[in-house]
């Protein structure tokens, strides 16, 4: 139970003994941490916790082989060797990271917290922190991608695919960055008196950052896609006075605004929660966040159970090549299994992931 | 002003249930930590247990676990403790305690009710 | 549990004596330490906490020191009104336990 007297942490602000050193807690119990914060601590398994960890393993056994399922569909398929479809693989490759962390947490959770020391107690958040942050920056890197082709006018953009790994190493190293800064000093083992509610080892001050960070994320996103989809819409009513298919430019459009919808409405439902709930957390003392923490956590997970299935499953190539592995068929066509497919039924391919395009002439 | 006032019958029969309450003004109830101490006159202070409105979360010391129920209603500010199955060795003075720090749990109290002798006799 | 042991268990001065009254606890609590002080018939009043610091309104001529195991209140010039019951308590977590009381009486 001994005090470790350390240098201050870059970040943290300790609390000073008279010796004016500061008073760290390294080999404290987590019980320590969780008592001081009034967070429960389970001594045994209750109802919730059961239902929470039954439901928690389910839906990390379905992020990963649905994600692992998104990796090999892109990686078989030469037709989705392009950089948008990297981009994609990435992001399954980070949800599929994400299931993996929060299985960790399921064996790590309930009554079982008590057993983690201080640094496998900050290994488990951080494993969740480098996922969930590496699945959002891939999303916005995605919709940038977007941005970009949309404005260029491509089906696909021109970026090589050396830039292309280095957009995913930029996005795997600030993940981990992210997931490492509580362990590496951002933490209240020395400065006990600004310790969390809802995750007793961390600082209030990295609670709002993180929630900060993410909704700031988030916004872009939406102004990204609500740019593209004004811009599109703006093209395709230009577009609808001079040309003889207005009906088939509509529907591209409504497609387009359909899957916006969906992969905004997804990202809000499954993150604005868990997200202002940190925040609450610190500003707002009287409210029972701690009532909720379960199961806006569950929320968040489920984005990534989600991803592969609004990025991919509403590509009707996709879908094929998934049948295609699952059925362990091989494909007579090296290019891909739909090569002559009316490509405008495709939605996502042809709204958020491939621009707008139909067939070979250009809608936007 | 912050206040902490503790309330019930001042006379219990052995093996009934003593039921005290802990009603709070001038600062935001569920924010802080409320915890039950008794002084006797053999033992000095004890430390019952403590319950955490904001969450409902409740700590008792070992001893009284099992017998002492803490629970709190945020609408009417109040505190309550339930001790079942006492004994003249439960006699004393019973206050509630505020917790010193918001939103977290010090485990040392800046605020005390005046305290309520509880006599416990047939 | 933490057991509290404090000494002495009553002490007679004078106005304007320096009294130091002493606590130990039975394992490390860091500065994890209050001190109460009690009139009769009164609730018990918080003095200092995490060892050394003092709550406020409280004057100056009290102070606490310590870490880990051992702790002192000090009163560097007694007065009348200082004259009552001291308890100690440690802060570091439940189950809470408090020292058997130090009175201090006038001589």
């Known amino acids: 139970m001994a005090a470790i007297s350390t240098s201050i942490p870059v970040i943290s602000q300790p609390q000073f003994t008279a010796m004016n050193e500061p008073q760290c807690f390294y080999n404290e119990s987590i019980a320590f941490f969780y008592n001081r914060s009034g967070k429960h601590l389970a001594t045994e398994w209750n109802t919730v916790s059961k239902l929470v960890m039954g439901l928690g393993i389910t839906v990390c056994i379905f992020i990963m082989l649905a994600n692992l399922l998104v990796m090999v569909a892109i990686y078989v398929n030469r037709r989705f060797h392009f950089p948008i479809y990297y981009l994609m693989a990435n992001l399954a490759a980070a949800d599929f990271f994400a299931g993996l962390a929060y299985f960790y947490l399921m064996f790590n959770t309930g009554p079982n917290t008590r057993r983690l020391t201080v640094s496998t107690w900050l290994l488990r958040q951080g494993l969740i922190d480098t996922s969930l942050t590496a699945s959002v920056a891939n999303l916005l890197a995605i919709a940038i991608e977007r941005h970009i082709t949309v404005f260029r006018m491509q089906l696909h953009t021109r970026m090589s695919n050396r830039r292309v790994v280095v957009v995913i190493v930029v996005i795997w190293t600030m993940a981990i960055v992210m997931g490492a800064i509580p362990s590496v000093g951002w933490n209240c083992i020395c400065d006990i008196e600004n310790c969390s509610n809802m995750a007793p080892l961390y600082s209030d001050s990295y609670l709002v950052f993180w929630a900060i960070f993410n909704l700031v994320t988030f916004v872009v996103m939406v102004v990204l896609y609500a740019h593209i989809f004004g811009y599109v819409r703006q093209r395709t009513m230009r577009m609808s006075r001079h040309s003889s298919g207005p009906r088939r430019n509509r529907d591209t459009m409504m497609s387009l605004l359909k899957t916006v919808v969906i992969v905004l409405g997804a990202f809000i439902i499954c993150w604005t929660p868990g997200l202002v709930l940190l925040l609450l957390d610190v500003c707002c003392p009287q409210c029972d966040v701690l009532a909720y923490e379960k199961f806006f956590l569950l929320l968040a997970e489920f984005n990534s159970a989600m991803n592969p299935i609004i990025y991919s499953y509403r590509d009707k190539e996709m879908s094929a090549t998934f049948r295609q592995i699952l059925c362990c068929q091989r494909s007579e066509n090296p290019t891909g299994p739909t090569e002559g497919s009316d490509r405008s039924a495709s939605s996502l391919n042809h709204t958020i992931l491939a621009g707008v395009h139909s067939n070979d002439h250009s809608v936007v | 002003q912050v206040q902490l006032q503790e309330s019930g019958p001042g006379l219990v029969k052995p093996s009934e249930t003593l039921s005290l309450t802990c009603t709070a003004s001038?600062?935001?109830?569920?924010?802080?930590?409320i915890s039950w101490v008794r002084q006797t006159p053999g033992k000095g202070l004890e430390w019952i247990g403590e319950?955490?409105?904001?969450?409902?979360?409740?700590y008792y010391n070992e001893k009284f676990k099992g017998r002492a129920t803490l629970s709190a209603d945020k609408s009417k500010n109040q505190a309550s403790l339930k001790l079942k199955s006492v004994t003249a060795a439960d006699t004393a003075i019973y206050f509630c305690?505020?917790?010193?720090?918001?939103?977290?749990?010090?485990?040392?109290?800046?605020?005390w009710g005046r305290g309520t002798l509880v006599t416990v006799s047939g | 549990d933490i057991q509290m042991t404090q000494t002495p268990s009553s002490l007679s001065a004078s106005v304007g004596d320096r009294v130091t009254i002493t606590c130990r606890a039975s394992?490390?609590?860091?500065?994890?330490l209050a001190w109460y002080q009690q009139k009769p018939g009164e609730a018990p009043k918080r003095v200092v906490y995490n060892a050394k610091t003092l709550t406020e309104g409280v004057p100056s001529r009290f102070s606490g020191s310590g870490s880990g195991t051992d702790f002192t209140l000090t009163i560097s010039s007694l007065q009348p009104e200082d004259f009552a019951t001291y308890y100690c308590q440690h802060h570091y977590g439940p189950p809470l336990t408090f020292g058997q009381g130090t009175k201090l009486e006038i001589k």
């Open positions: 319950i955490y409105p904001r969450s409902g979360n409740t």
């Open positions: 305690a505020r917790e010193s720090i918001s939103r977290r749990l010090g485990w040392n109290f800046d605020v």
């Open positions: 394992e490390n609590i860091y500065s994890f």
């Open positions: 001038g600062y935001t109830f569920t924010s802080y930590g």
